[in-house]
Interface confidence: low
């Protein structure tokens, strides 16, 4: 049967139909009504949120909506004592004290519940001792610090600005190199662009602007008390000395009015380079310690956060599909804010809730999906992905043998330059067919396809007159279904110009300043960026359901497959007396991208020609295609890794937001030359190239004719 | 029960002082961070200040930096607000608040009224 006869489908019930009932006006009602009050995680408001969206959806016509709940350890601030840092003279006086909470911008004054900032998860103590600037606390900052600065950070508390990595790389670097403390800022070069007003004026950070956030790392863990099963009333919950990930240090947030105050007294050593200095005007030099005059001032940190196990809710709506009803496609973004959530992560949750109304009313109309569509609401996210993963942890038997892909559905935007896409190489092919039907929403593009104002905006390096796509990292809640179950996954949104816009981040990521406002008079009025994102996310989420045959292509893995073991190979001969001594070859993933490869265009060929109308014949090709990611997982886990499970793709161990291919290998080689034992060192180079050969030939023989 | 009672407003002429005092009582106030807010005719909530639970640590919104200083006597159970150099835009009633966030409990407020 053809997928029409199959799905009860009337012509007007195609792709068309569902991307046309998308409207930017609902959008714009729903990210209005998403962000009146905060929704922090763990909250009776976003409870009360989680009610009203189960409700809609089952209003929208879903079949089934259920809210599925975990008891997971999540942190807050002390309501009786707050959290602050302070500069204190020889007596012992605070002589300076940062700001308790942010001011509330207009007409939120009288708003209760505004969580002040914090860092999430940070243990409670109230260390004293001299600052230690460390720019961005990167790793290659730190052997910056301490092998050519050879300035030792031990029993000092260290300031970093935001920017570049993930928080808690940053303080898991810092708790390394002996810091007692963290202090973390955003520096205006970071988080002030040029030639832009500060909020409320325009869409940049004010000096009493803060970003919140977590700091744990936990690696893929999901709930600290409860890794690998899911946090129910029956879990067996470690100790929190045994909790994953936590900190131990203490670790609290500030802006840049209060950073001023504590980095202009610093003394020590000048900063080493130019890239070392931010925008605010103090020297950044690097310390230890405050200069001269102010030598015998110290800074102490009061921290007294509490982490409490706290009830969480996930929605969990179903749309059964007709044909193929064990086969799921997955839409999943978070409901949890830090504060009103204007931009993370209602703009995603507000797509979300309007692709779903489109949905069900082509199903109200008689049609069904081919395949079962699950759409989620996550909670907890903002404290580490823990509602997704919990739900995956519970249902991960049935993930593994049915989930055919999750499209992630977090902020739809970060700026409103040109599309921004991450996801599996089985994905390219379906975005690029896709935004190659859409409507670009870009100035000066009018009547062309989004594929060309993308194209032009952000070019592939590769491959000319095509777009990038980029590598999936973590930070976001696809992680559970990528890099531990090994299901096809994508996010796509609207970026700023990475080019003229250096920032980390948006300015106002985390702060009490993300609201509707900052949306609808900045970043998009008409909500055409919005409608874009909503046509891109539901788009190939109706293909992954409603294709007869997946749309996944397996020789796009091949590409990029080349591309890896040319980089890692690459890597690796920046040592070739090291690699001559140890006998360290490539030869054998050359050679099994090279049958990958192969292999890979014969499949394609065969799914190309193959009788569409053989049932069996379908289903089994079909599981060939939803099985291919699966084949990328090593049940073993990553060295001290264990829940990042994918061979090819990994989170950076260096930056969890960032991707990085063939990761095994990769960290292998990080930083050898200094490794106490070669030996062992470039063993563990060679246990990883046999590990990723394996994986990589074991994948492509999973393409091989069945019989 | 938790009760907060705000007294010491009054009319006075620009550039004059005022010292408004918060009496609490129900709680254990020497646990609790508090705030002053201030709410114009026709207009919003607006946070003045704030005050650890120790004193050691305050905070003031822009247009009272200099001019306005709170404090608080733990023995005593009481908030005070002293304004000095006040200014027409000053009119408001003013409430003392309970906790950091959220603000639970709030007092009835009082008027503060400056005019020439």
């Known amino acids: 049967k053809s997928s029409s006869e199959a799905t009860n489908i009337t012509p007007k019930h195609n792709m068309k139909a569902f991307l046309d009932e998308l409207k930017a006006e609902n959008i714009k009602k729903f990210l209005h009504n998403f962000t009146q009050i905060p929704h922090l995680a763990g909250t009776e408001q976003n409870f009360q949120l989680a009610k009203q969206i189960q409700s809609q959806w089952k209003e929208f016509g879903l079949d089934s909506v259920e809210l599925t709940h975990y008891d997971v350890l999540l942190s807050y601030p002390n309501k009786t004592h707050p959290n602050y840092i302070s500069i204190i003279n020889e007596d012992g006086n605070e002589i300076f004290n940062t700001s308790l909470f942010e001011p509330p911008p207009a007409g939120y004054e009288n708003v209760s519940d505004i969580v002040p900032p914090f860092s999430a998860f940070s243990p409670q103590g109230m260390p004293e001792g001299d600052l230690v600037y460390v720019n961005y606390a990167r790793t290659e900052d730190f052997f910056k610090l301490e092998r050519d600065m050879k300035i030792n950070c031990s029993g000092k508390i260290v300031i970093a600005r935001y920017g570049k990595v993930f928080r808690g790389n940053k303080v898991k670097n810092a708790q390394l190199a002996g810091a007692t403390g963290v202090i973390l800022y955003s520096d205006p070069a970071d988080y002030f662009a040029p030639g832009v007003k500060s909020y409320p004026d325009g869409w940049n950070l004010p000096g009493g602007g803060v970003q919140r956030g977590n700091i744990l790392n936990l690696n893929g863990a999901g709930d600290p008390l409860t890794p690998g099963y899911p946090a129910n009333e029956y879990a067996y919950r470690r100790g929190i000395a045994e909790a994953v990930g936590l900190p131990s240090i203490p670790v609290h947030p500030i802006g840049y009015y209060d950073a001023q105050k504590l980095l202009e007294k610093m003394g020590g050593s000048a900063s080493p380079d130019s890239s070392w200095r931010g925008s605010l005007k103090v020297p950044y030099n690097v310390g230890p310690g405050f200069t001269g005059n102010f030598s015998t001032q110290k800074v102490k940190m009061h921290i007294h956060s509490t982490s409490e196990v706290t009830r969480i809710y996930n929605v969990i709506g179903t749309l059964r599909g007709a044909v193929e009803p064990d086969r799921y496609v997955i839409l999943g973004g978070h409901r949890d804010s830090w504060v009103f959530g204007g931009i993370d992560p209602q703009s995603g949750a507000a797509v979300v809730h309007e692709i779903v109304r489109s949905f069900g009313t082509l199903k109200k109309e008689g049609w069904r999906p081919r395949r079962t569509i699950l759409f989620a609401s996550w909670d907890a996210e903002e404290f580490g992905l823990l509602g997704s993963t919990e739900w995956a942890e519970e249902n991960s038997r049935l993930l593994q043998e049915r989930g055919v892909a999750y499209i992630n559905a977090d902020s739809s935007i970060e700026g409103n330059y040109t599309l921004r896409v991450d996801c599996t190489p089985l994905m390219y092919s379906l975005v690029y067919n896709l935004t190659k039907e859409l409507e670009s929403p870009d100035e000066g593009f009018e009547g062309k396809s989004l594929y060309e104002s993308w194209t032009k905006k952000s070019p592939s390096p590769e491959f000319s007159g095509m777009p990038r796509i980029s590598k999936l990292g973590s930070g976001n809640d696809f992680e559970v279904f990528f890099q531990r179950l090994g299901i096809a996954s994508g996010r796509a949104r609207y970026t700023k110009n990475w080019e003229t816009n250096k920032f980390s981040s948006y300015p106002l990521y985390h702060s009490v300043y993300e609201t509707y406002e900052l949306v609808e008079k900045f970043y998009d009025p008409m909500f055409k960026y919005h409608l874009t994102v909503a046509q891109v996310r539901g788009g190939m989420v109706f293909e992954l359901a409603n294709s007869v045959v997946l749309p996944f292509d397996c020789r796009d893995y091949a590409v990029v497959l080349r591309k890896y073991a040319d980089k890692i190979y690459n890597i690796s001969m920046k040592h070739p007396q090291e690699m001559k001594t140890y006998s360290v070859s490539f030869d054998s993933l050359f050679s099994a991208v090279k049958n990958f490869t192969e292999i890979a265009s014969k499949f394609s060929e065969r799914l190309r020609d193959f009788d569409k109308s053989n049932p069996i014949l379908l289903r089994m090709m079909n599981d060939q295609l939803m099985f291919l990611e699966r084949a990328f997982i090593d049940p073993l886990g990553l060295p001290d890794r264990p829940f990042y499970r994918h061979v090819i793709y990994a989170p950076s161990s260096h930056n969890k937001y960032a991707g990085e291919s063939f990761p095994g290998i990769y960290d292998a080689l990080f930083d050898i030359e200094s490794k106490v034992d070669p030996s062992q060192a470039w063993g563990e180079v060679k246990r990883q190239i046999s590990i990723a050969t394996f994986t990589v030939q074991a994948a492509a023989e999973t393409l091989s004719e069945v019989a | 029960q938790v009760q907060l009672v705000e007294s010491g407003g009054g009319v006075v002429q620009p550039g004059r002082s005022l010292r408004l005092s918060c009496a609490a009582s129900?709680?254990?106030?020497?646990?609790?961070?508090m705030h002053w807010v201030r709410q114009a005719p026709g207009k919003g909530l607006e946070w003045v200040a704030i005050?650890?639970?120790?004193?050691?640590?305050?905070y003031y919104t822009d247009s009272v930096k200099g001019r306005f200083t709170i404090s608080r006597d733990n023995s005593k159970n009481t908030l005070y607000l002293q304004m000095n150099s006040l200014r027409v835009e000053d009119t408001a009633v003013y409430y003392c608040?309970?906790?950091?966030?959220?603000?639970?409990?709030w007092g009835q407020g009082t008027t503060v009224t400056v005019s020439s």
């Open positions: 608040a309970k906790g950091l966030w959220p603000s639970d409990v």
């Open positions: 129900g709680f254990t106030f020497n646990n609790y961070g």
């Open positions: 005050i650890s639970y120790d004193g050691n640590t305050k």
